[in-house]
């Protein structure tokens, strides 16, 4: 079996302030089992945007139903974008661990740019 890859097909996305950003991410394998998380930025200071396993993320919706059998689409939408949301977003696959899940592989990132609303 080929090792799972995390595909973020869009290097960059431009969204007008107040609109919804769609950040695309798919994985190429059902193996290993484990959740997806989305982060803004990289390294220890990265900001968690969405965690499939747990948490409350009122601005985020998933494009696909995460409970759908054999789901490999982990794209998200972020509503009511503001300039403060600009940055690079990473889709990160975790593998099931005991007791904690373990980071497995990251996508290449998608840079979100925000266009100011015309005044």
């Amino acid at each position: 079996e080929e090792e799972l890859q995390v595909i973020q097909p869009d290097k960059s996305v431009l969204v007008a302030a107040g609109e919804t950003a769609t950040l695309r991410c798919t994985v190429t394998s059902l193996i290993p089992v484990g959740p997806i998380q989305w982060f803004r930025g990289a390294g220890p200071g990265r900001e968690l945007i969405y965690n499939q396993k747990e948490g409350h993320f009122p601005r985020v919706t998933t494009v696909s139903d995460s409970t759908k059998r054999n789901n490999m689409d982990f794209s998200i939408r972020i509503g009511n974008i503001t300039p403060a949301d600009a940055g690079t977003y990473y889709c990160v696959k975790f593998r099931k661990g005991s007791p904690d899940d373990v980071e497995f592989k990251s996508g290449a990132g998608t840079e979100l740019s925000v266009r100011a609303k015309p005044s």
Epitope: P35, Q52, E54, D65, S66, T67, K68, N70, N71
Partner: antibody
Framework: QVQLQQPGTELVRPGASVKLSCKAS????????INWVKQRPGQGLEWIAM????????HYNQIFKDKATLTVDKSSNTAYMQLSSLTSGDSAVYYC????????????WGRGTSVTVSS | DIVLTQSPASLAVSLGQRATISCRAS??????????IFWYQQKPGQPPKLLIY???NLDSGVPARFSGSGSGTDFTLNIHPVEEEDAATYYC????????FGGGTKLEIK
Amino acid sequence: QVQLQQPGTELVRPGASVKLSCKASGYTFTNYWINWVKQRPGQGLEWIAMIDPSDSETHYNQIFKDKATLTVDKSSNTAYMQLSSLTSGDSAVYYCAMDYGSLYAMDYWGRGTSVTVSS
Amino acid sequence: DIVLTQSPASLAVSLGQRATISCRASKSVSSSGYNYIFWYQQKPGQPPKLLIYLASNLDSGVPARFSGSGSGTDFTLNIHPVEEEDAATYYCQHSRELPTFGGGTKLEIK
């Protein structure tokens, strides 16, 4: 840490109904299927049914479709299975189990509820 | 429904030796390159524990002495070298369609 809490025992009269509970914690309840499995004393495992807590979609083993009814309460992160018209053949341990990979498998299990049907 | 037949129903294996358990499906449980077979271990008074998913992938925390193989209709769980704590009943399960379990194999350590 994923946990599925089930009451230890239920004693019920023949012909009555019982509603078994499975309280989930440590993960987003609506993101993962819940399965129910029956095990009679000294016997093997029988899959009863599964429910998607996000929209209450259910799939039943045909053998149990007139016996078991699955529901969820999203406000309390609890899955329920009601068993009706109980007979001695329904005396068993009933497990709930969570499907972490959307593969229709059972990754995390509750400790089970022992149901005894006796007059 | 797909029926899973496990064999043997019970076996006794000496400490340090190999235990081999078979699971045969009444029709193929493979689809899109995946084999939808799972293996569980159950000890008395405990719930089952997932060991192997999609036929050959070890679940987290499962010792490497456990391995799974097979495709289509014929699958095998191997334990080598067997340890005392491996005494348990082992079940296969498929999810090619709605799930069903095999009848179980009781492993005794000699």
